[in-house]
Interface confidence: medium
């Protein structure tokens, strides 16, 4: 798929929450629009709008447990995963095999992590030690954003770690499951 | 080639619980979520819940929560899927399937017959 | 939750015949929509994906349109191996749900 590698653990554990920048607000104005949940208007044709605000995410609710090490979080958080495309249904079909018909020169709209939030969480750790308490970012909402056939993983550095699943190694095309899903059971998924 | 290979029939007396399982291979079993979708004698298709094996994230539905427990065991590729409290109606064919990036189900296991009975 | 509402519940076509199956969502799920075929005893299989898209291997006689709340899948010109139950599935909104189903007979 080639999507950057990141560490296999349970969360990014935050020093101090002030490290983390504010992701810019490209869709503030819109935000509302940009949720799946909200069936975002599609455009009036595809690919002519210039308002990506237009297209809404595919926004996942998990919930999981933190982990650091052999300590979890006495309980679990709750987090989005952004998911797919978020732009309108391709205009070809696929190729034979694994292969992707790309448009000719049309961009690619991949739903990926928009905002991030800090929680505290207290983690128990085994064998009689003392709590500790963490801050973890967590993935708060999803965008899309405008990629062309071009552009590679790098298009997705700047979203964290967060942004791209584990080295797949097959497809070209950059995917945005966005944030490292989770544990235990959302109490109002819906 | 991915495959999804699950767990033989099962009879159980209503009350009880019932363990299924689905083993993955010809891929990275980590990178994708697996759903779990049952399908009634006769009936349609419906879903139950899902896990991203990565670590470990659940949701399920409604109508299934607190009843159903989805779980996986990275080291062997396998997810299971624990429903109890079992009653008549839970008789049925449970799947597993592994969702693409689109939110597609493109390969299913070959499907487990569970069925309740006094 | 989004009520997924298939037509027909089933119809009889001869092979050649061009076949038309509609889907309703409940609320608008803007493209994020599937088709899968299912044959008696076996696992359903993937069609369609995200409204359109034909999934690997699968015939170019099967095809995919629609947004929002209202989906079609067309089998251009039938063939003997495609009788078979057809579902849609909506993953815009947990919990994902799976239309009726379309059975797709022999006249």
């Known amino acids: 798929q080639g999507w950057q590698a990141f560490k296999n653990d349970a969360t990014e554990i935050i020093p101090e929450l002030g490290e983390y920048p504010e992701p810019p607000p490209e869709l503030e104005n819109n935000k509302t629009m940009n949720r799946a949940e909200n069936g975002g208007r599609p455009p009036h044709h595809p690919f002519e709008t210039k308002d990506v605000s237009e297209y809404s995410c595919r926004e996942l609710h998990f919930t999981r447990y933190v982990t650091d090490g052999q300590c979890r979080s006495a309980k679990p958080v709750t987090e989005l995963v952004c998911s797919g495309q978020c732009g309108p249904a391709r205009l070809l079909p696929n190729a034979i095999g694994r292969g992707k018909w790309w448009r000719p020169s049309g961009p690619d709209f991949r739903c990926i992590p928009d905002r991030y939030r800090a929680q505290r969480v207290q983690l128990l750790c085994p064998g009689g030690a003392a709590p500790r308490a963490r801050k973890v970012r967590l993935v708060a909402s999803c965008k899309c954003k405008r990629l062309t056939r071009f552009h590679n993983q790098s298009e997705l550095k700047d979203f964290g770690p967060e942004a791209a699943r584990p080295q797949k190694g097959r497809k070209p095309r950059p995917r945005a499951r966005g944030a490292k899903a989770n544990q235990a059971e959302l109490e109002n998924a819906y | 080639q991915v495959q999804l290979v699950q767990s033989g029939a099962e009879v159980k007396k209503p009350g009880s619980s019932v363990k299924v399982s689905c083993k993955a291979s010809?891929?990275?079993?980590?990178?994708?979520?697996l759903n779990w979708v049952r399908q009634a004698p006769g009936q349609g298709l419906e879903w139950m819940g899902t896990?991203?094996?990565?670590?470990?994230?659940?949701t399920y539905s409604q109508k299934f929560k607190g009843r159903v427990t989805i779980t996986a065991d990275k080291s062997t590729s396998t997810a299971y899927m624990e429903l109890s409290s079992l009653r008549s109606e839970d008789t049925a064919v449970y799947y597993c399937?592994?969702?693409?990036?689109?939110?597609?189900?493109?390969?299913w296991g070959q499907g487990t017959t569970v069925t309740v009975s006094s | 939750d989004i009520q997924m509402t298939q037509s027909p519940s089933s119809l009889s076509a001869s092979v050649g015949d061009r076949v038309t199956i509609t889907c309703s969502a409940s609320?608008?799920?803007?493209?994020?929509l599937n088709w899968y075929q299912q044959k008696p005893g076996k696992a359903p299989k993937l069609l369609i994906y995200?409204?359109?898209s034909l999934h690997s291997g699968v015939p170019s006689r099967f095809s995919g349109s629609g947004s929002g709340t209202d989906f079609t899948l067309t089998i251009s010109s039938l063939q003997p191996e495609d009788f078979a139950t057809y579902y849609c599935?909506?993953?815009?909104?947990?919990?994902?749900?799976f239309g009726g189903g379309t059975k797709v007979e022999i006249k």
């Open positions: 399937a592994r969702e693409e990036e689109d939110g597609q189900f493109d390969y």
């Open positions: 010809g891929y990275t079993f980590t990178d994708y979520f």
């Open positions: 896990i991203y094996p990565y670590h470990d994230g659940t």
């Open positions: 609320q608008g799920i803007q493209w994020y």
């Open positions: 995200y409204t359109s």
């Open positions: 599935q909506q993953h815009s909104k947990l919990p994902r749900t």
